[in-house]
C-alpha cells in the first residue's frame, strides 16, 4: 500500500494547526515540563512490518484524537483550529485504515503488534494523567501541545521511511 | 548533522548598532528556540534571552532587556542579536544555542562557534 | 531571580583522581539543572541534563546526581582531556541561570 502523498500533506498541517494553537506564551510554563516517556523505539521502524508500522501511527493519531476531543480540551482550545486539527487527524486515520486493509494478506505478520499498541496507549495515559493532576491548567496544555507535535515529527520520519520502502 | 552557524567576528565603534546572526541546518528550526548567551573576557557565561523561531515570541534577562533585541527570520532558519548602540562593555564573546522549548529533551545541546564583538573607539 | 553558586571556584587534580563539582540553587529547582564543559576558545559542551541524564556522546566517567537545590558533577577518573571549566545552568524557570564556574586545573 501506497501512503498518499496527500497524508504527508496532512500531517504538514497538522503540524501547522497545532502552531496556530498556542495561546499563552511558552516562556511562562518552563517548570512544568514533564517526562511522558515518548516511546521511541515504537517509531524507529526497524523491527516492523509495513502493517505493524501503520497500526501504530494510527494509533497514535486515534489517541491524540480522543485527547483532544475533550470538553477540557475544548475550553481550551480555539474553536476553529480544533475543528481543522479534527479535519486532518480524520483525513490521516482514513488514509493509514485504507493502507492497512490493503496489507491484509500481503504478509505474513499479524496486522499488529499488540505490545506496541499497548505502549503507545500507556504513553497516552500517562498524558492525561498528568492533565489531570495539573488540572488541565493552560500551562500543562501548552506543554501536552509540545509534546504532541514532537510526537507527530518523529512519527513523520516513521512514516517517510514506511514511504521508502516501497 | 545539527549545526549552528554564527557571523564572523566585528570590530564596532561606541555608539554603533549592530546585528549579529546564527544560522540552524540539520533539524526543524521551528521546533527548538534559540537562546543567546554573553561570556566577557575571562568571565562566566550569562544568559541573555531566548527566541521562539515559529512564532517569534521573546523572552530576556532582566540585565538585558532593552539593552539588545532578540529576532528570529524562519524563513532562512536563522536568528538574530542585536545592539543599536555598542557600548565598551558590551565586549564579549556571544553564543547561540538551541533549547528545545517545553519538551523533555537536553537544554543547550548544540552551540554555535560564538561571535566575538569588540567594540572600542 | 534563581541564583546557582558552585563550589569550589578552582581545584587542582592529577590524571586518574575523583572530581566532584557542587552547585547550589537559591530554591528548590526540582532536577533541571544541566552541566557544562567549556575549554579555552571553544563553546561551551552539555555533559548531563535533568540533573543526572548523561548527552549523547559523553563518556560515562561523568555523571550528576541531586535535586532541589544541591546537586554535584563527579568526574570518575580524570583524563587529560577534562581539564576545563565547568559549569552548572538551571533551566526550572526564566531568567535562565548559570553558576560562576569550575576550573579544573592539572595539579
Known amino acids: 500500500c501506497d501512503l498518499p502523498q496527500t497524508h504527508s500533506l496532512s500531517n504538514r498541517r497538522t503540524l501547522m494547526i497545532m502552531a496556530q494553537m498556542g495561546r499563552i506564551s511558552p516562556f511562562s510554563c518552563l517548570k512544568d515540563r514533564h517526562d511522558f516517556g515518548f516511546p521511541q523505539e515504537e517509531f524507529d521502524g526497524n523491527q516492523f512490518q509495513k502493517a505493524q508500522a501503520i497500526s501504530v501511527l494510527h494509533e497514535m493519531i486515534q489517541q491524540t484524537f480522543n485527547l483532544f476531543s475533550t470538553k477540557d480540551s475544548s475550553a481550551t482550545w480555539d474553536e476553529t483550529l480544533l475543528d481543522k486539527f479534527y479535519t486532518e487527524l480524520y483525513q490521516q486515520l482514513n488514509d493509514l485504515e485504507a493502507c492497512m486493509m490493503q496489507e491484509v494478506g500481503v504478509e505474513d505478520t499479524p496486522l499488529m503488534n499488540v505490545d506496541s499498541i499497548l505502549t503507545v496507549r500507556k504513553y497516552f495515559q500517562r498524558i492525561t494523567l498528568y492533565l489531570t493532576e495539573k488540572k488541565y491548567s493552560p500551562c500543562a496544555w501548552e506543554v501536552v501541545r509540545a509534546e504532541i507535535m514532537r510526537s507527530f515529527s518523529l512519527s513523520a520520519n516513521l512514516q517517510e521511511r514506511l514511504r521508502r520502502k516501497e | 548533522e545539527v549545526q549552528l552557524v554564527q557571523s564572523g567576528a566585528e570590530v564596532k565603534k561606541p555608539g554603533e548598532s549592530l546585528k549579529i546572526s546564527c544560522k540552524g541546518s540539520g533539524y526543524s528550526f521551528t521546533s527548538y528556540w534559540i537562546g543567546w548567551v554573553r561570556q566577557m573576557p575571562g568571565k562566566g557565561l550569562e544568559w541573555m534571552g531566548i527566541?521562539?523561531?515559529?512564532?517569534?515570541?521573546?523572552a530576556y534577562s532582566p540585565s538585558f532587556q532593552g539593552q539588545v533585541t532578540i529576532s528570529a527570520d524562519k524563513s532562512i532558519s536563522t536568528a538574530y542579536l542585536q545592539w543599536s548602540s555598542l557600548k565598551a562593555s558590551d565586549t564579549a564573546m556571544y553564543y547561540c544555542a538551541r533549547h528545545p522549548g517545553l519538551n523533555w529533551a537536553p537544554d543547550f545541546d548544540y552551540w554555535g562557534q560564538g561571535t566575538l564583538v569588540t567594540v572600542s573607539s | 531571580d534563581i541564583q546557582m553558586t558552585q563550589s569550589p571556584s578552582s581545584l587542582s587534580a592529577s590524571v586518574g583522581d575523583r572530581v566532584t563539582i557542587t552547585c547550589r540553587a537559591s530554591?528548590?529547582?526540582?532536577?533541571?539543572l544541566n552541566w557544562y564543559q567549556q575549554k579555552p576558545g571553544k563553546a561551551p559542551k552539555l555533559l548531563i541534563y535533568f540533573a543526572s541524564s548523561l548527552q549523547s556522546g559523553v563518556p560515562s566517567r561523568f555523571s550528576g546526581s541531586g535535586s532541589g537545590t544541591d546537586f554535584t558533577l563527579t568526574i570518575s577518573s580524570l583524563q587529560p582531556e577534562d581539564f576545563a571549566t565547568y559549569y552548572c545552568?538551571?533551566?526550572?524557570?526564566?531568567?535562565?541561570?548559570f553558576g560562576q564556574g569550575t576550573k579544573v586545573e592539572i595539579k
Open positions: 527566541i521562539d523561531p515559529s512564532d517569534s515570541d521573546t
Open positions: 545552568q538551571q533551566s526550572f524557570d526564566f531568567p535562565l541561570t
Open positions: 530554591q528548590s529547582i526540582d532536577g533541571a
